[in-house]
Interface confidence: low
């Protein structure tokens, strides 16, 4: 089901708007994939759940409210304040954990962006031309990454020399979309939490 369009207040924490757009875009893309790939295992029950960010980022730990994380780390996150250059924070002074949380989200988005772009390049070679990634979803990922980061980093596309297996690619697309939707929900909750704090 499509999520309702939220119209943010002009003064709202800027990344909340982007995260709402992201959640809506990935939900729409997942719905489209389920419908288009109806004869593929693409439902939440059928797929193997895989987290491409595992061991690379710590978004869930870093983004828990500070009250929950204060005893989690051997380093005291409350004693030291930090400033990042990410535009989502505007000129806010923020705790290290908040900066780390936003950085972890950025890293997640970057990893998914690489995977999605690589996958889209393969899907474009499919003679059936059955499904492609929604350009709006890719654009929304890009927008949120830019909002999180003043100094834009170029995201490399992974090159693949072997002949793509389109069946496997479509199954992987479903796996990635399911995982990314869960991450998008987390990101949206974090941004809502930061907007409220």
């Amino acid at each position: 089901r499509n999520l309702p369009v939220a119209t943010p207040d002009p003064g709202m924490f800027p990344c909340l708007h982007h995260s709402q757009n992201l959640l809506r875009a990935v939900s729409n893309m997942l719905q489209k994939a389920r419908q288009t790939l109806e004869f593929y295992p693409c439902t939440s029950e059928e797929i193997d759940h895989e987290d491409i960010t595992k061991d690379k980022t710590s978004t869930v730990e870093a983004c828990l409210p500070l009250e929950l994380t204060k005893n989690e780390s051997c380093l005291n996150s409350r004693e030291t304040s930090f400033i990042t250059n990410g535009s989502c924070l505007a000129s806010r002074k923020t705790s290290f954990m908040m900066a780390l949380c936003l950085s972890s989200i950025y890293e997640d988005l970057k990893m998914y962006q690489v995977e999605f772009k690589t996958m889209n390049a393969k899907l474009l070679m499919d003679p059936k031309r059955q499904i492609f990634l929604d350009q709006n979803m890719l654009a929304v990922i890009d927008e949120l990454m830019q909002a999180l980061n003043f100094n834009s980093e170029t995201v490399p596309q992974k090159s693949s020399l072997e002949e793509p297996d389109f069946y496997k690619t479509k199954i992987k697309l479903c796996i990635l979309l399911h995982a990314f939707r869960i991450r998008a929900v987390t990101i949206d909750r974090v941004m809502s939490y930061l907007n409220a704090s």
Epitope: S58, C74, T154, V155
Partner: nanobody, 118 residues
């Protein structure tokens, strides 16, 4: 096997500068955020700074903000910490860490000693 080797520490007078380096190997350096943490004599670990995998996002402790600059060269698999206007309270062993800088999750090097004294 993950290896992080820090260098560049030493004895410096207050107001002086140092550049710490951390040579990384055994993992895809460009895929990970990196951090510097430090441990002053008789104190616990303190986060100093972190930098995102591509170098675009960085963050600093209040105590070093405006004096220290973190950077990285992904082509050389090296992390840096440029330290200016050093103070006696910056005296510590500085460790380079892979990831968020929390020892539950991350590897860290053997450290390099920085002593600020006249």
């Amino acid at each position: 096997e993950v290896q992080l080797v820090e260098s560049g520490g030493g004895l410096v007078q207050p107001g002086g500068s140092l550049r710490l380096s951390c040579a990384a190997s055994g993992f895809t350096f460009s895929s990970y955020m990196m951090s510097w943490v430090r441990q002053a004599p008789g104190k616990g670990l303190e986060w100093v700074s972190f930098i995102s995998s591509g170098g675009g996002i960085s963050s600093y402790a209040d105590s070093v903000e405006g004096r220290f600059t973190i950077s990285r060269d992904n082509a050389k698999n090296t992390l840096y910490l440029h330290m200016n206007s050093l103070k006696p309270e910056d005296t510590a062993v500085y460790y380079c860490t892979k990831g968020r800088g929390d020892t539950r999750y991350d590897y860290r090097g053997q450290g390099t000693q920085v002593t600020v004294s006249s």
